[in-house]
């Protein structure tokens, strides 16, 4: 998941030269930016989150807020500071006229300002059948560990915490930050106010219809009786959780955010901070039948974003809309006709549908996994959720054609045993945002902080691309793909793996002078090849066919087109071994695949040759997929021949460590 989406409206107001009597001027050359929701009806003008630079102290935040009030008063404007943020993000929430934005953007320490906007609940007993491994019967669903060591925070509506299904499992905190209900004739009916939250609490930890029957929950009210909240209210809720965590550190925390609003830089930033403080956040992908990257918190890379499927593992349709999709979704989970506690009475059940219900399932699974292995990091948990998911069961035809390749075909499932997965080398595929069509456009895919980038590939629907390369950025490797002239844009695809004690580096060979092609290998002692990338400056790589990698030949070598620079990802980690596996098809074919066998994990996926009719290569679970242009356009010449090259790795060290534990 990335947050580089073009649809997000950003207004940049340049700082003027005169300082308007400020004691402290902003650093030279910096420009604070203004952001607002791209979905007009969801905007809440008049309330703004002023986000200050990362190192800003609480006292400076308060001083900046007071300065804004004083300067606004001099101009005859009333302002009201509604909240001063600290603990998660520095900043403050202010009620003021939009006329003051230019003034506010010039204040010292200001990083950016975001106009407040609305967030919404995302809801409109096969569910336990789907997430339960076959050896359990759903009618006697007794999970191996009920999540008893984990606390799940639910940010939602009010809830009926004494419902028979959840009594004693949910502690209602005194946190409440909700907007007024719309409409003068709105009648608050308690059971309706509690409906969404009660149902989700039941899905997570209900006695009879819950996923993690042992999990305890804490609820924060951020959605009103109509299921509507605000970005600012959600931020203050997340801050409340962080402060609670600091005051009284407990075991693992899962935060369930069964809500969605338009893309929000500040909400995504708050989620990132909380995730980096060791909290697992799970959110609804959204019910808009749209790209989840256009919504928050769904688009936050650190959050586990969940789409909804039905009993037949098909994407859920909700009226004219349905589940969101795309690269910002991590996985899907049951989200149609989910039975759960109903606030209509203390013993009632009801079925509800939506990505909220799907997210609640994953929060429950996460609670159980963390209860079994409390030391799991967010990256480890995400990788396990992906690893244990049902693969390739979703009918992708439901998704728009351009989103199919980007959307994970994964439906969440409980691991057959919550222990003993430690030996596995876990990897996942991360797609970048689309680069856009300009000649020099690039796209960047990043791994999570505690994942290793083991390989990098690229993909373009038009086939016009200039390959990809791994490069250092902020002390970490990233995967950058390059668009070509006349191309409609590219994607970068990172293969992100959990490899403890790894030491990885990239070795590059410039384009070869000779006609035999470019080669590069891992020359350091103990380093093995985990991935190959190639990047070229020319607009069109000709039909030159380089020699193809051979498993028995040079296992630590990447081979590519003579006009391309070749990049080898070389890693040293205890017990790491890798091998190259190829599948070449002499006749032209739109798709060539090669898979790693049982016990091995795909770390690298590339195509040979790198000629222009190859659209690109990407990993889907443990299979390397190489896509080429439509056969009818390439003809059936030898240029159509394509080889998919997979690099498959395993860790003997992890396997031994796991055997010693058992």
């Amino acid at each position: 998941q990335e947050d580089e989406d073009g649809d997000y409206e950003e207004l940049v107001l340049a700082l003027r030269s005169e300082e308007d009597g400020l004691a402290e001027a902003p650093e030279h050359g910096t420009t604070a930016t203004f952001h607002r929701c791209a979905k007009d009806p969801w905007r809440l003008p008049g309330t703004y989150v002023v986000v200050l630079k990362e190192e800003t102290h609480l006292s400076q935040s308060e001083r900046t807020a007071r300065r804004l009030q004083a300067q606004a008063a001099r101009r005859g404007y009333l302002t009201k500071i509604l909240h001063v943020f600290h603990g998660l993000l520095p900043g403050f929430l202010v009620k003021m006229s939009g006329d003051l934005l230019e003034l506010a953007l010039k204040l010292p320490h200001v990083d950016y300002i975001e106009e407040d906007s609305s967030v919404f609940a995302q809801s409109i007993p096969w569910n336990l059948e789907r997430i339960t491994p076959p050896r359990y019967r759903a009618d006697e669903y007794q999970p191996p560990d009920g999540g008893s060591l984990v606390e799940v925070y639910l940010l939602d509506t009010s809830i009926q915490s004494d419902h028979r299904e959840i009594e004693g499992r949910v502690m209602v905190t005194d946190f409440e930050n909700v907007p007024e209900e719309d409409g003068t004739r709105f009648h608050r009916q308690a059971s309706k106010c509690d409906s969404h939250g009660t149902h989700l609490a039941g899905v997570v930890s209900g006695r009879d219809a819950g996923v993690a029957k042992g999990a305890s929950m804490r609820s924060l009210r951020v959605l009103n009786c109509q299921g509507k909240g605000t970005v600012s209210g959600t931020l203050i809720g997340l801050e409340f959780i962080r402060k609670s965590q600091l005051v009284q550190p407990v075991g693992p925390l899962v935060v369930l955010l069964p809500l969605a609003g338009g893309y929000s830089r500040v909400l995504n930033a708050a989620c990132q901070r909380l995730a980096r403080a060791g909290v697992v956040l799970v959110t609804a992908a959204g019910n808009f039948r749209d790209d989840a990257c256009l919504y928050s918190p769904a688009s936050a890379p650190e959050v586990i974003t969940v789409g909804a499927t039905n009993a037949q593992d098909q994407p859920v349709t909700l009226g004219t809309l349905g589940t969101n999709f795309g690269r910002c979704v991590d996985l899907f989970a049951p989200g149609e006709d989910i039975i759960g506690a109903s606030s209509d009475c203390s013993t009632c059940f009801v079925s509800q549908s939506g990505t909220s219900q799907a997210a609640a399932h994953v929060a429950g699974i996460a609670a159980m996994m963390l209860s079994a292995e409390p030391e799991l990091t967010l990256a480890e948990l995400r990788q396990r959720l992906i690893h244990f998911s049902a693969k390739d069961v979703i009918n992708e035809a439901w998704f728009p054609e351009d989103q199919r390749v980007l959307t994970p075909n994964l439906v969440a499932a409980l691991p057959p045993s919550t222990h003993g997965a430690g030996w596995q080398l876990f990897c996942r595929t991360v797609w970048s945002a689309h680069s856009g069509p300009t000649r020099m456009a690039t796209a960047v895919a990043r791994c999570a902080p505690d994942e290793e980038l083991l390989s990098c590939s690229s993909f373009s629907r038009s086939g016009k691309r200039r390959g990809e390369r791994m490069e250092a950025q902020g002390g970490k490797l990233v995967c950058r793909a390059h668009n070509a002239f006349g191309g409609e844009g590219v994607y970068a695809i990172a293969r992100c793996c959990l490899l403890p004690q790894a030491n990885c580096s990239v070795h590059t060979a410039p384009p070869a002078e000779a006609s035999m092609g470019t080669r590069v290998h891992c020359h350091q002692q103990g380093h093995v090849l985990t991935g190959c990338s190639s990047h070229w400056e020319v607009e069109d790589l000709g039909t030159h066919k380089p020699p193809v990698l051979r498993p028995r030949g040079q296992p630590n070598q990447c081979v590519g087109h003579r006009e391309a620079s070749i990049h080898a990802s070389c890693c040293h980690a205890p017990g790491l071994e890798c091998k190259v596996k190829e599948h070449g098809i002499p006749a032209p074919q739109e798709q060539v695949t090669v898979a790693c066998e049982e016990g091995w994990t795909l770390t690298g996926c590339s195509a040979l040759p790198g000629t222009s009719h190859v659209l690109g290569a990407y990993a889907v679970d443990n299979t390397c997929v190489v896509r080429s242009r439509d056969v009818s356009t390439t003809g059936s010449t030898s240029e159509g021949a394509v080889t998919a090259v997979a690099i498959c790795c395993r860790s003997r060290h992890l396997a031994q460590a796991s055997q010693e534990l058992q």
């Epitope: 007794q142 915490s161 004494d162 028979r164 009594e167 004693g168 009475c345 203390s346 013993t347």
Partner: antibody
Framework: QVQLVQSGAEVKKPGASVKVSCKAS????????ISWVRQAPGQGLEWMGW????????NYAQKLQGRGTMTTDPSTSTAYMELRSLRSDDTAVYYC????????WGQGTTVTVSS | QSALTQPASVSGSPGQSITISCTGT?????????VSWYQQHPGKAPKLMIY???NRPSGVSNRFSGSKSGNTASLTISGLQAEDEADYYC?????????FGGGTKLTVL
């Protein structure tokens, strides 16, 4: 610690009403309702119903047939069970217990219906 | 709601194990994960011994265990002790209410 303290014994005539109270302490009231259970002399336990501290909602056993009313007063952390049109077979020990899970019980209130 | 069926009495010698059964239907015991067991000594309030079929509240001896198969739940007491002599009641959710068993008198010989 979690405690439920009930009102004292009552002796009533047939046709009269009785109101038994149950004061809760030591836990978050709104996380649990109160169940009422009775036990006639030498007999087993009989669930009478449940009442919510959160919103005052009730769930009565069919057998009460409209003779019983359960209420709560969150300001005093007290639940009440009123039984009207008492008959001799209503003679029993009346217990309040925490929630549907009935994990904590009051000491019991003996109600004797005798002419 | 008809009561769940329990044996009227069971007995055992100190140190032995005994099992008390509780039979219902798919609408109560068989349909829910929420079967509880209570111990009641004469003149005292009932005490929760097992909840949600298998779980023991803190402070309850691990000699007490619960299980369920189909429409029948069971309470097993191992290593019988004199203080275990009491009445035992099972309880289950039904769709809208709660139902108790008729009770079982346990005698420690």
């Amino acid at each position: 610690q979690v405690q439920l303290v009930q009102s004292g014994a009552e002796v009533k005539k047939p046709g009269a009403s009785v109101k038994v109270s149950c004061k809760a302490s030591g836990y978050t009231l709104t996380s649990y309702g109160i169940s009422w259970v009775r036990q006639a002399p030498g007999q087993g336990l009989e669930w009478m119903g449940w009442v919510s501290f959160y919103n005052g909602n009730t769930n009565y056993a069919q057998k009460l047939q409209g003779r019983g009313t359960m209420t709560t007063d969150p300001s005093t952390s007290t639940a009440y069970m009123e039984l009207r049109s008492l008959r001799s077979d209503d003679t029993a020990v009346y217990y309040c217990a925490r929630g549907y899970g009935m994990d904590v019980w009051g000491q019991g209130t003996t109600v004797t219906v005798s002419s | 709601q008809s009561a769940l069926t329990q044996p009227a009495s069971v007995s055992g010698s100190p140190g032995q194990s005994i099992t008390i059964s509780c039979t219902g239907t798919s609408s109560d015991v068989g349909g829910y994960n929420s079967v509880s067991w209570y111990q009641q000594h004469p003149g005292k309030a009932p005490k929760l011994m097992i909840y949600e079929v298998t779980n023991r509240p803190s402070g309850v001896s691990n000699r007490f265990s619960g299980s369920k198969s189909g429409n029948t739940a069971s309470l097993t007491i191992s290593g019988l002790q004199a203080e275990d002599e009491a009445d035992y009641y099972c309880n289950s959710y039904t769709s809208t209410s709660m139902v108790f068993g008729g009770g079982t008198k346990l005698t420690v010989l």
